[in-house]
């Protein structure tokens, strides 16, 4: 039996009750709400420990948020016949700590995947490519949302978290069609060197609220479609000439740099000159110095070369602690 359940959608959702008989393919799984008209299934805040096996084949939008899934195994969504229409999958806040290789295989229409707010201690290199071949079949993913997936320190593997995420993004060159990538709030200290080179279709990249200190080894050169680059709330001290030239060379990009601890010394001169003439940076008039102390809260656009000096390096015999 199914009872109507309130929903913000205009289509009615049917809440399923568990039954002794196996459900027909178009019935709604236990603990879920379904709308065939909206092609949507919501299994939200139900403490599910695994993905329901009896998802209706019409599902286009699947919400599995606020559960206790822990592990997403290979073929977690593999069904026969396949869930061929599933285009948007939201798994945020479901206490996932492990996503295994091939977890999203047999979702041939999957365009948007949200794994945010899961403490991923293990993300398989083949989570998105599905196979360990050097070149995999292209993933259909267009939007990949991985905000706040960093695990607590005591759950981290030995290898770097940045490296683990990067390996999953580049494996098999499967994500060449990705347009949107959100990696906000992940405590990233650096961006692995070759990641962006493998994501040539990116239009939107969000790296905000991380701990990025430098972009020296990051190349944006081949991101010719990039429209938005979010670098707010990081630990950036200065952008060097190579980075400035690459950003200026991107035809459509808008860069967001608010709330970084800019160091306004002699190394900042090129960036200030660039800021004054570029149209690339959004809200550039809000950018202010954080260091040195005498420059705190000065607006970068108002600085001139005389303001940007470096203390002479003292010989060791004259240095004090």
């Amino acid at each position: 039996t199914s009872s109507a359940s309130s929903s913000s959608s205009s289509a009615p959702f049917l809440a399923s009750a568990a039954s002794a008989q196996p459900p027909l393919p178009d019935q709604c799984p236990a603990l879920c709400e379904c709308s065939e008209a909206a092609r949507t299934v919501k299994c939200v805040n139900r403490n599910l420990t695994e993905v329901p096996t009896d998802l209706p084949l019409y599902v286009r939008n699947l919400f599995l948020t606020g559960n206790q899934l822990a592990v997403l195994p290979a073929g977690a969504f593999a069904r026969r016949p396949p869930l061929a229409e599933l285009a948007a999958l939201n798994l945020s806040g479901s206490r996932l700590d492990e996503v295994r290789g091939g977890a999203f295989e047999h979702l041939p229409s999957l365009r948007q995947l949200d794994l945010s707010h899961n403490p991923l201690a293990y993300l398989s290199p083949f989570a998105f490519s599905g196979s360990n071949a050097s070149i995999s079949a292209p993933s259909p993913l267009v939007e990949l949302i991985l905000n706040h997936i960093v695990p607590p320190d005591d759950k981290r593997q030995n290898r770097s978290f940045e490296g683990m995420v990067a390996a999953a993004l580049v494996a098999g060159r499967a994500l060449q069609g990705l347009h949107l990538l959100e990696l906000a709030s992940n405590h990233f200290l650096y961006l692995p060197r070759d990641v962006l080179a493998q994501l040539p279709s990116l239009r939107y990249l969000d790296l905000s609220n991380n701990s990025l200190v430098s972009l020296t080894y990051v190349s944006f050169r081949n991101l010719t479609h990039l429209e938005s680059l979010h670098l707010e709330d990081n630990a950036l001290k200065v952008l060097h000439n190579g980075t400035l030239a690459e950003l200026q060379g991107l035809p459509h990009v808008r860069v967001f740099l608010d709330n970084n601890p800019w160091v306004c010394d002699c190394h900042m001169a090129d960036m200030v000159t660039w800021l004054k003439q570029t149209g690339v940076v959004q809200g550039k008039d809000r950018l202010t110095c954080a260091f040195p102390e005498k420059m705190r809260n000065r607006v970068l656009l108002e600085l001139n070369s005389a303001d940007l000096d470096c203390d002479p390096i003292l010989p060791p015999s004259l240095q004090t602690s």
Partner: antibody, heavy 127, light 112 residues
Framework: QVQLQQPGAELVKPGASVKMSCKAS?????SYWITWVKQRPGQGLEW???????????NYNEKFKSKATLTVDTSSSTAYMQLSSLTSEDSAVYNC????????????????????WGQGTSVTVSS | DVLMTQTPLSLPVSLGDQASISCRSS???????????LEWYLQKPGQSPKLLIY???NRFSGVPDRFSGSGSGTDFTLKISRVEAEDLGVYYC?????????FGSGTKLEIK
């Protein structure tokens, strides 16, 4: 190239069990289902069930649920089907087949079928 | 279970003739996502079945264009425009939409 290898024949006694194998090669074993099909002499085909090696999850035809058990060993890319409490009704040829996406010239992501088949294992139940 | 009824059971033809095999399902096998998982397989003597047609009307790679599939809902047809000697064997329709998946009883194509 894709291959599914099955032993040719098994002779078993009534009441006993038999475990037959289907060794896959030439593709990523964990990414395609293995389907099992029964064919009695001079009769048609029956779908027994299938298993997805990536997760080990099996689906069964209700008719065969108490008869067949499907398993896989991913380390050797081999699928197994065990048949228990055998009777003469179980004498048949058992085929394994690969089920999954068809990579054809026309790219249709919804195109799935059983595209490769093993040669079949002939099971004879006789005392 | 979805019953797949094939007709005729036996189809004697002359080489070069057209052959037509019908398959009818006891209920619609159009799935809720709009796909119809209806396939045709050919089993030649002493061999395993081979895929000919998937999703009602799509020829599998390597299958000659003299084979065509059509139909919708519950009624489906396999046509062979000009029968050749290598086409002889038993043809099975198969529905992969509803568990348990089921085969038709088979149609034996033989020389007149």
């Amino acid at each position: 190239q894709v291959q599914l290898q099955q032993p040719g024949a098994e002779l078993v006694k009534p009441g006993a069990s038999v475990k037959m194998s289907c060794k896959a090669s030439g593709y990523t074993f964990t990414s395609y289902w293995i389907t099992w099909v029964k064919q009695r002499p001079g009769q048609g085909l029956e779908w027994i069930g299938d298993i997805y090696p990536g997760s080990g999850r099996a689906n069964y035809n209700e008719k065969f649920k108490s008869k067949a058990t499907l398993t896989v060993d991913t380390s050797s890319s081999t699928a197994y089907m065990q048949l228990s409490s055998l009777t003469s009704e179980d004498s048949a040829v058992y085929n394994c087949a690969r089920y999954g996406p068809l990579f054809t010239t026309v790219v249709d992501p919804n195109s799935y079928a059983m595209d490769y088949w093993g040669q079949g294992t002939s099971v004879t139940v006789s005392s | 279970d979805v019953l797949m009824t094939q007709t005729p059971l036996s189809l004697p033809v002359s080489l070069g003739d057209q052959a037509s095999i019908s398959c009818r399902s006891s209920q619609s096998i159009v799935y809720s996502n709009g796909n119809t998982y209806l396939e045709w397989y050919l089993q030649k003597p002493g061999q395993s079945p081979k895929l000919l047609i998937y999703k009602v009307s799509n020829r599998f790679s390597g299958v000659p264009d003299r084979f065509s599939g059509s139909g919708s809902g519950t009624d489906f047809t396999l046509k062979i425009s000009r029968v050749e000697a290598e086409d002889l064997g038993v043809y099975y329709c198969f529905q992969g939409s509803h568990v348990p998946f089921t085969f038709g009883s088979g149609t034996k194509l033989e020389i007149k």
